[in-house]
């Protein structure tokens, strides 16, 4: 129960890649307005969006200060024009979010081959070492910096000429393989987080093929 | 618990085909890499393909490319071997294993194994 | 494709006996080497992943190593339910290969 024409929010979902992290929310209001609280299990309740009429908040801010704890938010409803207003429990009415731990549950962003470089039948392609929102000493850190070796990345490569998609892995951002001479490859690739049981892997990033500006050919 | 169930084989004659099954449960396939192994009777383990079945890519051994495909229904969290114009060197157990997807780890889990065999 | 040499192609050996499988790769694959144990009419079980690291639930009389393209299976005392056949496994590159499979009998 609730004052009149207050709704409490529902469908509390967290949407969250690579740390950037919002909570979404229903409905969209008619005349009522939300205030986000977020909380780690041990720690106080602290207050984003205040009285706003959107149905997210970005609690980025929040989530990268500790990324393996576990947060969980709630949604309060208010009275549009009327914040003081409470529901008849002397409360206003809010919903509680699932817990999330953005460590183990934000989505692996779409990776980026930065380039490829043959040299004789090797190739060597490096993958971009995305930026976060994660700060440590008031720097941000890569996606290696927060996952460490718990993050993998799967290279999937293939002649222009052919469908079958050969696969390698490494625990860096480095690639180095085989090739037949004189072909040309198609590269793309796919974070992995093989620890996790859920969003284990990314989307892949866009096919990069030899031949193109990112690439550089050397014959030895 | 992880477990995958390999079914759909049986007798089939040269040039004929097969459908095999492999549906797993304890895990989502999607997160994941399903592969095909084959052992024939008395021999050692082949390895016959793999598919991601997130982004549907694929690789085949040379002895069964163009013949065989892999494919997979992540709504039903099964992965197949449709397998075409089937010789009697096809005759196997076939086995479709987890790839854990790590650097370090890769076929953790197995299916029972269910048997082709490619007999006139 | 890469060659998973592996030797010897069978074996007798007693209960309690140390027993080594070695397996030669025909480039290098770095650690990426596994062992699986397989009993007749059941499916491989990983024994060993990434050259020397024991899976789990595995006991701990089962080791592995690897010196170059060279890898090693040891099973330190043999038991009764060890007497099966293991197959290494390179993943370096696709495809991935097996080694020819070393069957432990009774001696």
């Known amino acids: 129960s609730g004052t009149t024409n207050t709704v409490a929010a529902y469908n509390l979902t967290w949407k969250s890649t690579n740390f950037k992290t919002i909570l979404e929310w229903e409905p969209k209001p008619v005349n009522q307005v939300y205030t986000v609280q977020i909380s780690t299990k041990s720690g106080d309740w602290k207050s984003k969006c205040f009285y706003t009429t959107d149905t997210e908040c970005d609690l980025t801010d929040e989530i990268v200060k500790d990324v393996k704890q576990t947060y969980l938010a709630r949604v309060f409803s208010y009275p549009a024009g009327n914040v003081e207003s409470t529901g008849s429990a002397g409360e206003p009415l809010y919903e509680n979010s699932p817990e999330f731990t953005p460590y183990l549950e934000t989505n692996l962003g779409q990776p980026t081959i930065q380039s490829f470089e043959q040299v004789g039948t090797k190739v060597n392609v490096t993958v971009e070492d995305e930026r976060t929102l994660v700060r440590r000493n008031n720097t941000f850190l890569s996606l290696r910096d927060v996952f460490g070796k718990d993050l993998i990345y799967t290279l999937y490569y293939w002649k222009s000429s052919s469908s079958g998609k050969k696969t390698a892995k490494t625990n860096t951002n480095e690639f180095l393989i085989d090739v037949d001479k004189g072909e040309n490859y198609c590269f793309s690739v796919q974070a992995v987080i093989p620890s996790r049981t859920v969003n284990r892997k990314s989307t892949d990033s866009p096919v990069e093929c030899m031949g193109q500006e990112k690439g550089e050919f050397r014959e030895i | 618990e992880v477990q995958l169930v390999e079914s759909g084989g049986g007798l089939v004659q040269p040039g004929g085909s097969l459908r095999l099954s492999c549906a797993a449960s304890?895990?989502?396939?999607?997160?994941?890499?399903i592969h095909w192994v084959r052992q024939a009777p008395g021999k050692g383990l082949e390895w016959v393909g793999y598919?991601?079945?997130?982004?549907?890519?694929?690789y085949y051994a040379d002895s069964v490319k163009g013949r065989f495909t892999i494919s997979a229904d992540t709504s039903k969290n099964t992965a197949y071997l449709q397998m075409n114009s089937l010789r009697a060197e096809d005759t196997a157990v076939y086995y479709c294993?987890?790839?854990?997807?790590?650097?370090?780890?890769?076929?953790?889990?197995w299916g029972q194994g269910t048997l082709v065999t490619v007999s006139s | 494709d890469i060659q998973m040499t592996q030797s010897p192609s069978s074996l007798s050996a007693s209960v309690g006996d140390r027993v080594t499988i070695t397996c030669r790769a025909s480039?290098?694959?770095?650690?990426?080497v596994a062992w699986y144990q397989q009993k007749p009419g059941k499916a491989p079980k990983l024994l060993i992943y990434?050259?020397?690291f024991l899976y789990s639930g595995v006991p701990s009389r089962f080791s592995g190593s690897r010196s170059g393209t060279d890898f090693t299976l040891t099973i330190s005392s043999l038991q009764p339910e060890d007497f099966a056949t293991y197959y290494c496994?390179?993943?370096?590159?696709?495809?991935?290969?097996f080694g020819q499979g070393t069957k432990v009998e009774i001696k």
């Open positions: 480039q290098d694959v770095n650690t990426a």
């Open positions: 990434s050259a020397s």
């Open positions: 496994q390179q993943h370096y590159t696709t495809p991935p290969t």
């Open positions: 294993a987890r790839d854990y997807g790590s650097w370090r780890i890769r076929l953790d889990y």
């Open positions: 304890g895990f989502t396939i999607s997160q994941y890499w």
């Open positions: 598919i991601d079945p997130y982004n549907g890519y694929t």
